[in-house]
């Protein structure tokens, strides 16, 4: 009998937004207030998030899907689902546990959130820094001083009367 | 491309400890975190801590976890101690990009607390 209750088990009946209620003879009931279910056969509705304090309610809770929270003006989401809010800084700073402090020189940070990250080393790319970096800015990389030799431009071709071997001065 | 590997889940009885280790590759991570989801339950936070070692904890382990990170800022770790079986669970690494724009997972380890 036992295997044949699995193999046809009543809970599996059981449409997201409800429970299987073993208090009333395995009936599929309601979620209560304030739970959901977001899958059939459930044999408990779970709780619904609260947003509150720094958190925000973005979309509300219903009997089959939980409630998502963003952050109030001046903070941030960190992590999956808005795990966290965190302050916002300026850009050109990041938050640390001191708060909010500028960028050091060689970083910056283009956004009210995250790290202060390294400027591009355009050496990598064998290309020269055309506009410095700032706490706020990326440095832009562009051509190498090589490149840009006389006759030679990113549009026209290079102009063929250099020697081989000849670098510019 | 981006990599977050866990390890140094196991079984262990309640009142013991265990260390897992997030190794994280292929981006700059401003913040790394522990969640964890138990058997038939919603994935739940655990732990944060940010590049410039701000820690946080969910109520239920804080005074019995402790996250920290190594020296290297891509190696993280979450210390266990006096585990209860209600710890029981795959944890999972995570770690938001330089921009808190995105989080990257890891595949997981099981940790199983027996009474």
């Known amino acids: 009998f036992e295997r044949t209750r699995s193999l046809q088990d009543p809970c599996s009946n059981c449409p997201a937004g409800t429970f299987c209620d073993n208090n009333r003879n395995q009936i599929c009931s309601p979620c209560p207030p304030n739970s959901f279910s977001s899958a059939g056969g459930q044999r408990t509705c779970d709780i619904c998030r609260q947003c509150k304090g720094v958190f925000r309610t973005r979309k509300e809770c219903s009997s089959t899907s939980n409630a998502e929270c963003d952050c109030t003006p001046g903070f941030h989401c960190l992590g999956a689902g808005c795990s966290m809010c965190e302050q916002d800084c300026k850009q050109g700073q990041e938050l640390t546990k001191k708060g909010c402090k500028d960028c050091c020189f060689g970083t910056f940070n283009d956004q009210k959130r995250g790290i202060c990250r390294p400027w591009t080393n355009c050496s990598l790319d064998g290309k020269s820094v055309l506009v410095n970096g700032t706490k706020e800015r990326d440095v832009v990389c562009g051509p190498s001083p090589a490149d840009l030799s006389p006759g030679a431009s990113s549009v026209t071709p290079p102009a063929p009367a250099r020697e081989p071997g000849h670098s510019p001065q | 491309q981006v990599q977050l590997v866990e390890s140094g889940g196991g079984l262990v009885q309640a009142g013991g400890s265990l260390r897992l280790s997030c190794a994280a590759s292929?981006?700059?991570?401003?913040?790394m975190f522990w969640y964890r989801q138990p058997q038939g339950k919603q994935r739940e936070y655990v732990a944060h801590i940010t590049s410039n070692g701000r820690t946080n904890y969910a109520d239920s382990v804080t005074g019995r976890f402790t996250i920290s990170r190594g020296n290297n800022d891509n190696t993280m770790y979450l210390q266990m101690d006096n585990l209860k079986p209600q710890d029981t669970a795959v944890y999972y690494c995570?770690?938001?990009?330089?921009?808190?724009?995105?989080?990257?997972w890891g595949q997981g380890t099981q940790v199983t607390v027996s009474s």
């Open positions: 292929g981006d700059i991570f401003s913040i």
């Open positions: 995570a770690a938001d990009d330089a921009t808190n724009t995105r989080t990257y």
